[in-house]
């Protein structure tokens, strides 16, 4: 009897959909695996007789519930199927956006770039998929614990009237208000402000 794959799960970030599993202990030799997806009531092979413990399902429709399954094989024997269901638009993790930060005197000018999507044109981003897409920005004075959050209305934001000659850190994430779903924070970007632009009288 061939044991089934273990810990079968979908790892999906920005619609890069990777079905992952672990190979069970099996004394007779090395196992191979076959992974399939349900299409119009028929299961179709996606990865056949692979020695890998993952299979790329990024070409699935972003919409709807998909049934995926994987089994282990050895010679002419095979395990039972292990099934999971997956809805990309609901289940994919929103990866961190890109961010460009520029210091201008006592202000930080930020521009945000929505995450790109697997198997899509360069210009079709997560912002195109989710109509309610917005950004959350948090910033803080480097070395302090107090964080401030803002929700920019556009793909850019300016933090004004900051303390001169002070290092501020900023990070951004995608947020979907209609789903109350937040993405992953970007890595903090820390920049030092320069002089206060006000001219002494």
């Amino acid at each position: 009897m061939v044991p089934p794959p273990e810990n079968v799960r979908m790892n999906s970030v920005n619609f890069k959909n990777i079905l992952q599993w672990e190979s069970p202990a099996f004394a007779k030799g090395n196992l191979t695996f076959t992974a399939q997806y349900l299409s119009y009531r028929i299961f179709q092979d996606k990865c056949m007789n692979t020695t890998l413990t993952e299979c790329d399902f990024s070409s699935l429709s972003k919409y709807g519930d998909h049934t995926l399954r994987v089994r282990a094989e050895f010679a002419d024997e095979h395990s039972d199927w292990v099934n999971i269901t997956f809805c990309p638009v609901d289940d994919t993790i929103i990866g961190p956006p890109g961010m460009q930060v520029e210091v201008l005197a006592d202000s930080l000018h930020m521009r945000f770039l929505a995450p790109k999507i697997e198997n899509e044109y360069e210009t079709w981003t997560m912002k195109n998929v989710y109509n309610s897409w917005t950004y959350n920005v948090q910033y803080w004075k480097n070395g302090t614990d107090e964080k401030f959050q803002i929700t920019p209305q556009y793909d850019f934001e300016v933090l004004r009237n900051l303390e001169p000659w002070t290092t501020y850190c900023v990070q951004v994430r995608g947020f979907l208000p209609d789903r109350n779903k937040a993405g992953e924070w970007s890595e903090p970007v820390c920049e030092q402000t320069t002089h206060d632009e006000t001219v002494p009288s």
Partner: nanobody, 124 residues
């Protein structure tokens, strides 16, 4: 059932131009995303371009960027693909497709309705 009908294909010399059209028979082309795909002889289906109804944004495959232009005329319920500076590698059957959910642009899995295709041949 929605029927998409393409037209405008034909034989053209390298460097020439063609304009493809796609109309929905008896229906409007009022879909969140509509796009063009192509299939060259012996190859798989390839995304060419799409247009999003929500913001009118247009998106292109790298291989056609700067040469092809997608547009729609809502008054005529027609989608167009203006193809300039055509090359031999653009030879393919071109398909129009429409998506009900509008979540994707390039992947054929994200489209629900398809036309029968129109042949484009670029040859001297």
């Amino acid at each position: 059932e929605v029927q998409l009908v393409e037209s405008g294909g034909g034989l053209v010399q390298p460097g020439g131009s063609l304009r493809l059209s796609c109309a929905a028979s008896g229906n409007s082309l009022d879909y969140p995303t509509i796009g063009w795909f192509r299939q060259a002889p012996g190859k798989g289906l390839e995304g060419v371009s799409c247009i999003s109804a929500s913001d009118g944004s247009t998106h292109y495959a790298d291989s056609v960027k700067g040469r092809f232009t997608i547009s729609r005329d809502n008054s005529k319920n027609t989608l167009y693909l203006q193809m300039n500076s055509l090359r031999a590698e653009d030879t393919a059957v071109y398909y129009c497709a429409a998506s009900l959910h509008g979540l994707g642009c390039k992947s054929e899995a994200d489209y629900d309705y398809w036309g029968q295709g129109t042949q484009v041949t670029v040859s001297s």
